[in-house]
Every structure is written in C-alpha cells, then in structure tokens.
Interface confidence: medium
Amino acid sequence: LRRCLISTDMHHIEESFQEIKRAIQAKDTFPNVTILSTLETLQIIKPLDVCCVTKNLLAFYVDRVFKDHQEPNPKILRKISSIANSFLYMQKTLRQCQEQRQCHCRQEATNATRVIHDNYDQLEVHAAAIKSLGELDVFLAWINKNHEVMFSA
C-alpha cells in the first residue's frame, strides 16, 4: 500500500502554478465556459474512484493539455514544464497502484473523466488548453482534499 502514496511535493507544484496563473488566466477568452471548474463533476467522486479519476486527470493534462498548449514566454514555459514533470512522476506512482489492482475504474469515474474531455473538445484546441491550465488549481485542490481518502482506502 505504501507504494500507492503520491510522494510528489504538492506544495512545489502549487507554488509553480501560483507564479503563472494570472498570466495564463488572462489569455482565457471564454470566462463563462468551464472544463474542470464544474466542481460537481469532481465533488461527487466516491473514495473508491479517487485513484482512477486522479490517474485519468493526470493523463488528461499530460497527454492533451500540456501538449496542446504553446507557450511563447520562456519563464512561464519553465514553470509549466516543471508541473508537467511532477505530473509524469505522479503517473508513475499510480501505475504501481494499478499493478496492485488498487486503481480500478468504475463507471462513475469513467463518466466524470468523459465530461471533462467533452468540455475540452467543445473549445478550439488552444483555447481549451489555456482554460484547462487556468483551472489547474481546481485539480490541485481536489488532489489535496482527496489525498488522505485515496490512500487510506
């Protein structure tokens, strides 16, 4: 069970995001649209599904958001790269959970992830990436909130 713990320094990720979030959110041209911030999507996740949703959202950011976003500012790009590397490390940790069959994906978890991907698909790719980056604090807060639940299950 110990190997399931996300040992990444969440505070470091949050600090990196805090330093860039206004610059990212300033480029968001769809204020009344949301991808993750419909927190209901994440709030209704049961403890059993937390590992799966975390795994899926990490994949969402690593495979879609970070790849789709084109950042011209090298200082901001460095911070985003740092967050991306932390997410890759977290993915590696969660793969160990999967190998121990502790990260089963039930229907509710799959549905929650699908909603987020659908929201993303409704926007033009660069606008969607900007908005998802701007909503990183929602995901980070959710991880923090569910961290204990996730690994005591």
Partner: antibody, heavy 120, light 111 residues
Framework: QQLEESGGGLVQPEGSLTLTCTAS?????????ICWVRQAPGKGLEWLAC????????TYYANWAEGRFTISKTSSTTVTLQMTSLTAADTATYFC?????????????WGPGTLVTVSS | AIDMTQTPASVSEPVGGTVTIKCQAS??????LAWYQQKPGQPPKLLIY???TLASGVPSRFRGSGSGREFTLTISDLECADAATYYC?????????????FGGGTEVVVK
C-alpha cells in the same frame, strides 16, 4: 491580508511622483493582478494600470495612461506607480488593488488610498 | 477603449424596496463584468464578478445578470446599509490589450 498606498502629497504641475503599494500578510511572489485605480474628488473610478506579479511580469495600461504612468514590481511586497508630467487633472485619491475583477480563489483586496494633489 | 454607460445616475427607493441598475458596454465583453459598491471615504468593495458570481461574503440580495453588452445589478430588500455609489467595470482583454473601464456610477439613496 492588507494593501497600503504611500507616497501621495502635494506636487507642482509638470512634476513627477512615485506611489508605492505595500502588501502585508501575503507576497507578490505569487501571481496576482495588482492594479492602480484613481478617483478625483467627487468623481467616479478610473482604471490606470495593472501588473501580473508572477513570473510573466505582464503590464497593462489604460490607453490615455501609457507613457506617462509606469507600473513596476519593485520587491516581493511592493508595487510602484511612477507618474510624470502631472497636471491639476491628476489630482485624485489613488488606490492600489489586488484582483480587482474578482476570482473564485482570491478575494479582491483594496488599500485605503493615498491623496495626490497637483497644484502650484 | 470600451465605454461603459451606467443608468440611472441616481435612484431613491424605500427600505425593503428593489433597485435595478443597468450597465451598457460599447462592444460585447462576454461576461467580463464586475460590480462594485463604494461608500464615502472608503475604497470600493467587490460585489459581483463574471457578471453574475457573488463575491465572498456578499448577501444574495445582490444579483448580477446579463452578458455581451447589457448588464444589470438588482438589489432587493433594500437596507439602509445599501446606500452607496455602485459602479460597473469591464475587464475585457484581447491578445495584447486590456480594458478595465468603469461606468460613471449610480448613487443609491435609501429612504
């Protein structure tokens, strides 16, 4: 968490002045929009400029303020507004504010203001 | 620059009444609009952001609506403490500019 403006006072026409916005209880190391807004006596609010205190350092100005006003982050707790070629029309209370347009995460925060009087 | 036109300039209503303040932008600003309350000698206080989202600690008697060019602030069940000047403010940004223009303000007198 508080903001406080300083540096106001009496200045001659065509003179210059630098106002300072000082944060306490939080740091400008994180990314916030820190903006300057002014209010002439008995008049409405007028936006001057904003700066992203994070790594981007992006600055934005009202069209009419560009060139005469300069917003800068000078330390992890201070943001300044440099004003040049001042006229009587610049007489106002100058406010600094954090995230003036609101956010689900951070509350909007304003200083009490500092009065600038341009007169000979 | 975006012009924000606020109406009326002044309104007087009794305690318990309802006040409606309108704000019109010179171009579409989506829902990038905030409402502020200011009392004499005090800095402005944010009431509503993103056109309709209540800021923290603001009572639900305050309601914002609208998008595009037309916006409304409605204050219901008026209290004496609501006597103040109210401002709308756009915070619209393009790729290389921002506009944070304020409306001219509406003075609310509570009788």
């Amino acid at each position: 968490q508080q903001l406080e403006e300083s540096g106001g006072g009496l200045v001659q026409p065509e003179g210059s002045l630098t106002l300072t916005c000082t944060a306490s209880g939080f740091s400008f190391s994180s990314s916030y929009w820190i903006c300057w807004v002014r209010q002439a006596p008995g008049k409405g609010l007028e936006w001057l400029a904003c700066i992203d205190t994070g790594v981007s350092g992006d600055t934005y100005y009202a069209n009419w303020a560009e060139g005469r006003f300069t917003i800068s982050k000078t330390s992890s707790t201070t943001v300044t507004l440099q004003m040049t070629s001042l006229t009587a029309a610049d007489t106002a209370t100058y406010f600094c504010a954090r995230d003036i347009f609101g956010s689900a995460i951070d509350n909007s925060l304003w200083g009490p203001g500092t009065l600038v009087t341009v007169s000979s | 620059a975006i012009d924000m036109t606020q109406t009326p300039a002044s309104v007087s209503e009794p305690v318990g009444g309802t006040v409606t303040i309108k704000c019109q932008a010179s171009q579409s600003i989506s829902s990038y609009l905030a409402w502020y309350q200011q009392k004499p000698g005090q800095p402005p206080k944010l009431l509503i952001y993103s056109a309709s989202t209540l800021a923290s600690g603001v009572p639900s008697r305050f309601r914002g609506s609208g998008s595009g060019r037309e916006f409304t602030l409605t204050i219901s069940d008026l209290e004496c403490a609501d006597a103040a000047t109210y401002y709308c403010q756009c915070h619209y940004h393009g790729s290389s500019y921002w506009d944070n223009s304020f409306g001219g303000g509406t003075e609310v007198v509570v009788k």
